[in-house]
């Protein structure tokens, strides 16, 4: 057969669906690979063909669209399962072609099982709520296109295994779940089960997401350097090891990159001809505020090194700060027999 533009296996879109539930999967060609949509392709005389490779098989085979009750069907650029079965797992390919043009892409589809508490190998999206921030909502995700707007589904929300009713600060409102004032105790997995009728059958859509309560932007501050500070002096003798920790607190900020770095005499550590090592550790609070510690160490410090300026810098989306460490050379304690005796005129 003539050549086909093969976009390979698109592992970026690892699609997971629950067993025994409807699933609608759009051909990724039109969303991510081609510069035109399905309608344009269709009106230009191009045909969309679907086929698949079962799990642990190499053989590509056509999809059987003649199953009882149209269990698998295609509508425009969407492949429908009503519902899925466990052995539908595999790599699916959609190919767009006519006599002169051909383009195809494959993607993995995994049908997963869930238990009665909605636990499964499904990768869960994480929704972050700000602590004590007023009313915030989460919405039952990925249910668009499953039923027409004339159909009014029933939606039941669960936290973990428990149906949400008469919860203190969490109120189900149809497709939305409202948190009146989010607290740490609201951390957990939330599931919406959407039930709708179609052609005399009842289908269920199960969607689980993880709620993580994080620091509020109302409380966010620029980075705070706890160390070095004005109260600690790093006093060393030449030949000793110099260790200076830079400890910085960062408020949680959505999509902020938190950074800590050292400069020596205003330069990058590698621009100074001394053997410096820097080690970093990171810890998080329950609301994802972050504390970063970078320890600057010089194994055998020289008197020259003790005259240098060591500055710790920190930056987040809230701002940038810097603090110099107080470093000085220790004055050796006088040795009595030499220094003091000399003072008394001993020879």
């Amino acid at each position: 057969s003539e050549r086909c533009d093969d976009w390979g296996l698109d592992t970026m879109r690892q699609i997971q669906v629950f067993e025994d539930e409807p699933a609608r999967i759009k051909c990724p060609l039109f969303e991510h690979f081609l510069k035109f949509n399905y309608s344009t392709a269709h009106s230009a005389g191009l045909t969309l063909i679907w086929y698949w490779t079962r799990q642990d098989r190499d053989l590509e085979e056509p999809i059987n669209f003649r199953l009882p009750e149209n269990r698998i069907s295609k509508e425009k650029d969407v492949l429908w399962f009503r519902p899925t079965l466990l052995n539908d797992t595999g790599n699916y390919t959609c190919m767009l072609r006519n006599t002169t043009y051909c383009s195809k892409v494959a993607f993995p589809l995994e049908v997963v099982q869930k238990d009665s508490c909605f636990n499964s190998p499904m990768k869960l999206p994480v929704h972050k709520l700000y602590i004590e921030y007023g009313i915030q909502r989460i919405t039952c995700p990925n249910v668009d296109g499953y039923f027409p707007s004339s159909v009014k589904p029933t939606i039941t929300w669960y936290m973990g295994c428990y149906k949400i009713q008469n919860f203190n600060n969490v109120i189900p409102e149809g497709m939305n779940l409202s948190f009146l004032i989010a607290l740490i105790s609201n951390n957990g997995n939330y599931t919406c089960v959407v039930t709708y009728p179609e052609n005399g059958r009842t289908f269920h859509l199960t969607r689980t997401l993880t709620v993580k309560v994080v620091g509020s932007p109302k409380n966010a501050v620029p980075p705070v350097i706890h160390s070095p500070n004005d109260h600690v002096v790093y006093e060393k003798e030449p030949g000793e090891e110099l260790l200076i920790p830079c400890t910085v607190y960062f408020s949680f900020l959505m999509d902020s990159r938190n950074e800590v770095w050292w400069t020596i005499d205003g330069k990058k550590p590698d621009d100074i001809t001394i053997d410096v090592t820097i080690n970093e550790s990171i810890s998080h609070s329950r609301t994802e505020d972050e504390t970063r510690t970078q320890i600057l160490s010089i194994k055998k410090v020289t008197s020259e090194d003790l005259k240098r300026s060591y500055v710790c810098h920190a930056r987040s989306a809230k701002g940038e700060v810097a603090k110099a460490a107080k470093v000085k050379q220790k004055v050796p304690a006088p040795r009595y027999t030499v220094e003091l005796a000399c003072g008394f005129g001993a020879t």
Epitope: P222, R257, K268, D270, I282, R315, G319, V321
Partner: antibody, heavy 118, light 113 residues
Amino acid sequence: QVQLVQSGAEVKRPGASVKVSCKASGYTFTGYYMHWVRQAPGQGLEWMGWINPYSGGTDYAQKFQDRVTMTRDTSISTAYMELSRLRSDDTAVYYCARSYYYYGMDVWGQGITVTVSS
Amino acid sequence: DIVMTQSPDSLAVSLGERATINCKSSQNIINSSTNKNYLAWYKQKPGQPPKLLIYWASTRESGVPDRFSGSGSGTDFTLTISSLQAEDVAVYYCQQYYSTPFTFGGGTKVEIK
């Protein structure tokens, strides 16, 4: 001395992926960000993203977000950039460059030519 | 995204004369807490990678001749070559690293008149 050495030229078909490497030597690999910058023939410089070799954290330009993956192997001081679903307009010289936080990109690799052609 | 606009596109200057390249950012790239402008200048010769000349808008990278200087603040920046030498023939780029995506200007080609 400080240097970044990149892998050899690549010729790829549209739809394929390319993974290029950048081996660092002469400095503490985990102490500097590694950027990837590309330059199409006769064009200017385009920043693709960076990786923090210490943590593995990345930040990609929106344009490449769903096609690029930057990784590193600290045991061999090497950074990698993989670009998938290649198109003919991805034909370019791809550079790696290091930076110490906000001090500019002070050391660059020699560049690697990736040609995408059917 | 911050857009960096360089002018002129090309510049022909006699040897020993001054060359001035401008760069304008679509938004402020000064960090108010450190008073530093997050702007770098690079020089690129054909077939070679770029070379860092200036960072923080005006700090010369070590080893860069002092005929190269950077100035400006906020949104308007200038690279000056005080006395053009033959080896300065190249394309010069400005780049902001205030916020990602870090963006480059379109480049200015400097030639000898």
